[in-house]
């Protein structure tokens, strides 16, 4: 069977005027997940992206995550998708006073 | 086992419109991105646009404005729609399963394409 | 957009001859290429994806090397079923686009 993922967002400072927005998939399986960023619902490239491997977490399940780097004040723009297993959902950035999102998948 | 099969009208006069379908089998459309791309006779590849697991849709920009790509989850079916359609339109149209892992995005599995010609 | 460059539009080669296709992008794109093979008949399939990855069911003798702008696919062992062309895909930036192909043909 699957299990699927906990979806965590987080934002942190990255330099004046940007912030750093992870989505962070944990405890899923099988080990194939699609974790992405949009913009305004466009796919960012690849390249604007970056990636950590899909690793075991210890469980016998999963993790990883996707970064990108956005102007401070655009965070409404952007959501990271997840498909995993036939099912998908979409995450928010959280607001500033906000540092998690966390979102069980069913 | 994973197959995708496309159904085009074959031949399409100058300025209509093309309908393309392309049916699936082996996976579940709303956990997989189908992806469009077109072959002119004796050309190249060219990626057209995708849609995902959830609807959203992705398009080449040069053909945007006369693209429209969606689906059916139920029927296992995706739709490709152009607009005012010209004679370099005419090309065999591929529909492609993409599998979009982290740094990996690939298109793992093909149909065998439909030809479209458009002429009057 | 990328531009995918394949300056070798086709090759003929003798069976079991090493064979390299090379493919060149107009700029750099981390690695970000795959590699397919189609048939006379037009069936496509993947053969080598992220530079080098090799997907279950193609042979071994297939193999794809590279980095920054300059990627090679090459066949150590050339046998009938090879004849094919073959392109290149970026998907650094979207959209994704692909080389103008490389057809091999037997001597």
């Known amino acids: 069977g699957s299990v699927p993922p906990m979806v965590n967002v987080t934002r942190s400072e990255a330099s004046e005027g940007n912030i750093t927005v992870t989505c962070r998939a944990s405890s899923f399986y099988p080990r194939n997940i699609t974790l992405t960023w949009r913009q305004d619902g466009v796919s960012l490239s690849h390249d604007t992206q970056q990636w950590g491997d899909v690793l075991p977490d210890g469980n016998g399940t999963y993790q990883t995550w996707v970064a990108t780097r956005i102007c401070q004040g655009e965070e409404q723009r952007f959501t990271c998708y997840m498909e995993h297993s036939g099912n998908h959902s979409t995450h928010p950035v959280p607001s500033g006073n906000s540092h998690h999102h966390h979102h069980h998948h069913h | 086992q994973v197959q995708l099969k496309e159904s085009g009208p074959g031949l399409v006069a100058p300025s209509q419109s093309l309908s393309i379908t392309c049916t699936v089998s082996g996976f579940a459309l709303t956990g997989s991105g189908v992806n469009w791309v077109r072959q002119p006779p004796g050309k190249g590849l060219e990626w057209l646009g995708m849609i995902w697991g959830d609807g959203n849709t992705d398009y080449n920009s040069a053909l945007k404005s006369r693209l429209s790509i969606s689906k059916d989850n139920s029927k296992s079916q995706i739709f490709l729609k152009m607009n005012s359609l010209q004679t370099d339109d005419t090309a065999r149209y591929y529909c492609a399963r993409g599998a979009h892992y982290g740094k990996r995005w690939y298109f793992d599995v093909w149909g065998a394409g439909t030809t479209v010609t458009v002429s009057s | 957009d990328i531009q995918m460059t394949q300056t070798t539009s086709s090759l003929s080669a003798s069976l079991g001859d090493r064979v390299t296709i090379s493919c060149s992008a107009s700029q750099g794109i981390n690695n970000y290429l795959n590699w397919y093979q189609q048939k006379p008949d037009g069936t496509v399939k993947l053969l080598i994806y992220y530079t080098s990855s090799l997907p279950s069911g193609v042979p071994s003798r297939f193999s794809g090397s590279g980095s920054g702008t300059d990627y090679s696919l090459t066949i150590s062992n050339l046998e009938p079923e090879d004849i094919a062309t073959y392109y290149c895909?970026?998907?650094?930036?979207?959209?994704?686009?692909f080389g103008g192909g490389t057809k091999v043909e037997i001597k």
């Open positions: 895909q970026q998907y650094s930036k979207l959209p994704p686009t």
